[in-house]
């Protein structure tokens, strides 16, 4: 029977800069029941606080609700593992909410084949930003990426859409069924997961010729 091994805070993520969650990996338990607590202070302050919510984020997590999430402030946090034989502490982790944002995937992905009479046909893709993101505040710039491939193909074709929420693709294989997905990322932060795939059948008479 031993004191617990050193835990490690391995990830912190925020869906929208208004709340965030951090997760840790326990070290070895030393063969004894082990309690974990996450403590932190904000840069420029010495008063320590304890994790306000160990439940919402699942096992070995700490969720910071709105009243505990401060923009423009760095959090300095560590996890303490304690059993009957002693304690061990994780390394301190410095967290700035601005840089840990990972949005939910974009919503309402719509894909349509457009075949104007006087121009080349194209695939028109449209989507909406994730619900939790308020773009009106100006705090966020979301960038988008689209990927698509024929249903049976192995390789994805990736297009960067910038800040726009619609996109046109001209070069497609007629008669193929395509999968289309979109994802987003803030200017600082992480790519969201890909949205659920939308399928579109490209007509056989879809021409790629000028």
């Amino acid at each position: 029977q031993l004191p617990p091994g050193k835990p490690e805070i391995f990830k912190c993520r925020s869906p929208n800069k208004e709340t965030f969650t951090c997760w840790w990996r326990p070290g070895t338990d030393g063969g004894l029941p082990t309690n974990y607590s996450l403590t932190y202070h904000r840069e420029g302050e010495t008063l320590m606080h304890e994790c306000p919510d160990y439940i919402t984020g699942g096992p070995n997590s700490c969720h910071f609700g709105k009243q505990y999430t401060s923009m423009w402030r760095t959090y300095i946090m560590m996890v303490n593992a304690t059993n009957q034989m002693g304690s061990s502490f994780s390394d301190e982790l410095y967290v700035d909410v601005t840089y840990i944002v990972q949005p939910d995937p974009p919503l309402e992905l719509a894909v349509e084949v457009k075949q104007p009479e006087d121009r080349k046909p194209y695939l028109w893709i449209k989507w909406s930003p994730p619900t939790l993101i308020d773009l009106k505040t100006g705090w966020f710039t979301l960038l988008y990426e689209i990927r698509l491939k024929p249903e049976k193909a192995a390789e994805w074709e990736i297009h960067f859409a910038g800040q726009q929420t619609e996109f046109k693709i001209l070069s497609l294989h007629p008669g193929q069924k395509y999968l289309v997905q979109v994802r987003c990322k803030p200017d600082h932060g992480y790519w969201s997961a890909w949205s659920p795939a939308t399928f579109i059948q490209i007509p056989s008479d879809f021409t790629m010729n000028d």
Epitope: S37, R42, L47, E50, C51, P52, K66, Q67, Y68
Partner: antibody, heavy 118, light 106 residues
Framework: EVMLVESGGGLVQPGGSRKLSCAAS????????MNWVRQAPEKGLEWVAY????????YYADTVKGRFTISRDNPKNTLFLQMTSLRSEDTAMYYC???????????WGQGTTLTVSS | DIVMTQSPAIMSASPGEKVTMTCSAS?????MHWYQQKSSTSPKLWIY???KLASGVPGRFSGSGSGNSYSLTTSSMEAEDVATYYC?????????FGGGTKLEIK
């Protein structure tokens, strides 16, 4: 509605002990840091002790360190202050208050009066 | 310890007069908080994070400051403002209050 109701005050002899309680309701008690603040008669406010949401962090004012113990029972939504080796200068109104995020003392109880006298 | 010094200790103002009280901290702070306490009642959170008014606080009140120096102002004194106002720092242990400014009406 957030409510904090203190109890346990009264008259105690110097050197005696007393335990104050604070019953909390109207909010998720286990998510909030809690404090005791006191006010001697005709004097200003003095912070006494702080306990974090899960009791991992505890702070005391130097004036009470080693004599007072703050604790909490989250399932019962109750905050405690165990006071020992009481002195006449501990005579005060004792308030239970909470930390709302980083906003200290957004709610206060009505207070309970402790008198230390022979 | 961070020592908080409030001035003046007592002040008197006529109705409608602008009133400013100050709080000086012995160390630089990021935020200051203020509490109002009327006679024989529990204190109330009045201003938090230096300049944000707590719920129910009249708009004639304001807070400002940075570093070591902070102030609470009421733009137009009213009878209901008669109270003692305490500044407070919650950034570092031990948590400390100022000695209070008692605001009276002429």
């Amino acid at each position: 509605e957030v409510m904090l109701v203190e109890s346990g005050g009264g008259l105690v002899q110097p050197g005696g002990s007393r335990k104050l309680s604070c019953a909390a309701s109207g909010f998720t008690f286990s998510s909030f840091g809690m404090n005791w603040v006191r006010q001697a008669p005709e004097k200003g406010l003095e912070w006494v002790a702080y306990i974090s949401s899960g009791s991992s962090i505890i702070y005391y004012a130097d004036t009470v360190k080693g004599r007072f113990t703050i604790s909490r029972d989250n399932p019962k939504n109750t905050l405690f202050l165990q006071m020992t080796s009481l002195r006449s200068e501990d005579t005060a109104m004792y308030y239970c208050t909470r930390f709302y995020g980083y906003i200290p003392f957004d709610y206060w109880g009505q207070g309970t009066t402790l008198t230390v006298s022979s | 310890d961070i020592v908080m010094t409030q001035s003046p200790a007592i002040m008197s103002a006529s109705p409608g007069e602008k009133v400013t009280m100050t709080c000086s901290a012995s160390s630089s702070l990021i935020y200051m908080h203020w509490y109002q306490q009327k006679s024989s009642t529990s204190p109330k959170l009045w201003i938090y994070d230096t300049s944000k008014l707590a719920s129910g606080v009249p708009g004639r009140f304001s807070g400002s400051g940075s570093g070591n120096s902070y102030s609470l102002t009421t733009s137009s004194m009213e009878a209901e403002d008669v109270a003692t106002y305490y500044c407070f720092q919650g950034s570092g242990y031990p948590l400390t209050f100022g000695g209070g400014t008692k605001l009276e009406i002429k």
